[in-house]
C-alpha cells in the first residue's frame, strides 16, 4: 500500500517544493529514463494521490549537501 501522507496541489505544492528544495530549485517532472519513458511528474504523484517528504525531495534539482 502507498505510504501515508497528504495531497498537495497548485500553489500549495509549489510552496512546499520551494521550502523542501530551498535554493536547489526543483523539477515538475524528472527526466525520462530509457526504461521509463512514461515517467510521472510531481503533480501526478502528490496532487492525485498522497505523497511524503522523501518523494518531494526527489524532485529537487540537485542533491542535498551531506554534512
Amino acid at each position: 500500500a502507498y505510504g501515508p501522507g497528504e495531497t498537495l496541489c497548485g500553489g500549495e505544492l509549489v510552496d512546499t517544493l520551494q521550502f523542501v528544495c530551498s535554493d536547489r530549485g526543483f523539477y515538475f517532472s524528472r527526466p525520462s529514463s530509457r526504461a521509463n519513458r512514461r515517467s510521472r511528474g510531481i503533480v501526478e504523484e502528490c496532487c492525485f494521490r498522497s505523497c511524503d517528504l522523501a518523494l518531494l525531495e526527489t524532485y529537487c534539482a540537485t542533491p542535498a549537501k551531506s554534512e
Partner: antibody, heavy 119, light 112 residues
Framework: QVQLQESGPGLVKPSETLSLTCTVS????????WSWIRQPPGKGLEWIGY???????NYNPSLKSRVTISVDTSKNQFSLKLSSVTAADTAVYYC?????????????WGQGTTVTVSS | QSVLTQPPSVSGAPGQRVTISCTGS?????????VHWYQQLPGTAPKLLIY???NRPSGVPDRFSGSKSGTSASLAITGLQADDEADYYC???????????FGGGTKLTVLG
C-alpha cells in the same frame, strides 16, 4: 468563484486544426491546473490533457501527437489545438479546472462547446 | 473499452439506495490514486460530486457518498430522488497510461 467559458468555431473541416479557447474569470490562471475534456455524441467523457501554469503539461497518449494546450496569462485564457481532425473528433469540448482544494478532482467546468467535423 | 469499468445502467425507486461501482487495476485505483465522481444531468456539463474517494464539495447533499477499497471504488446514493436521474462518471489517474482516465459512465434511472 472561478468561472470558465469555452469559445471557438462550431464547424471544422476534416484534416484541419480545431482551435478552442477557455476564458477564466474570478481567478488567476497562474494558480490552478487547467484541463480539456471532450464528449462525443451519446458517449462518455474523454480526458484530452491538462497543464499547470509553470509550463507542466500532460496529454492523453492517444491524442498526444495532435494536441497542444497553451496559455495566455495576459488574457487569463488557455487554449486547445487539435490537428488533423476527423469525424471522430466531433464532440462537446469542455474546459475544466482543478483548484487544488479537491485532491485533483475537476471542480469547475465550462458549459461546453459543440464542435462538428464535417466538410 | 474504458480503463475504469462501470455498469452501463442502474435503477431504483424513489427513496431507495443505489450503488455504482468503478473497477480499476493496480495501475490506477490500486496504486493509491484518488477517485473522483461526477454527475452529469441531461444536457449539462459534468459536476464534481465526490473528490478524493469520499469527500463532498460544499453544496452536495450527504445522500451522496464515496468509498474505495483495493482496486475498486463505489458511489452510494441514498434516499433516491427524481432529480438524481443522470449519468455518473468515476475518474482517476493511471500510471501505465500516464494520464487521467474516466469510467465509461453509468446511467441512473429513477423508477416511477
Amino acid at each position: 468563484q472561478v468561472q470558465l467559458q469555452e469559445s471557438g468555431p462550431g464547424l471544422v473541416k476534416p484534416s484541419e486544426t480545431l482551435s478552442l479557447t477557455c476564458t477564466v474569470s474570478g481567478g488567476s490562471i497562474s494558480s490552478y491546473y487547467w484541463s480539456w475534456i471532450r464528449q462525443p455524441p451519446g458517449k462518455g467523457l474523454e480526458w484530452i490533457g491538462y497543464f499547470f501554469y509553470s509550463g507542466y503539461t500532460n496529454y492523453n497518449p492517444s491524442l498526444k501527437s495532435r494536441v497542444t494546450i497553451s496559455v495566455d496569462t495576459s488574457k487569463n485564457q488557455f487554449s486547445l489545438k487539435l490537428s488533423s481532425v476527423t469525424a471522430a473528433d466531433t464532440a462537446v469540448y469542455y474546459c475544466a479546472c482543478i483548484t487544488g482544494t479537491t485532491k485533483g478532482g475537476m471542480d469547475v467546468w465550462g458549459q461546453g462547446t459543440t464542435v462538428t467535423v464535417s466538410s | 473499452q474504458s480503463v475504469l469499468t462501470q455498469p452501463p445502467s442502474v435503477s431504483g425507486a424513489p427513496g431507495q439506495r443505489v450503488t455504482i461501482s468503478c473497477t480499476g487495476s493496480s495501475s490506477n485505483i490500486g496504486a493509491g490514486y484518488d477517485v473522483h465522481w461526477y454527475q452529469q444531468l441531461p444536457g449539462t456539463a459534468p459536476k464534481l460530486l465526490i473528490y478524493g474517494n469520499n469527500n463532498r464539495p460544499s453544496g452536495v447533499p450527504d445522500r451522496f457518498s464515496g468509498s474505495k477499497s483495493g482496486t475498486s471504488a463505489s458511489l452510494a446514493i441514498t434516499g433516491l430522488q427524481a432529480d438524481d436521474e443522470a449519468d455518473y462518471y468515476c475518474q482517476s489517474f493511471d500510471s501505465s497510461l500516464s494520464g487521467s482516465v474516466f469510467g465509461g459512465g453509468t446511467k441512473l434511472t429513477v423508477l416511477g
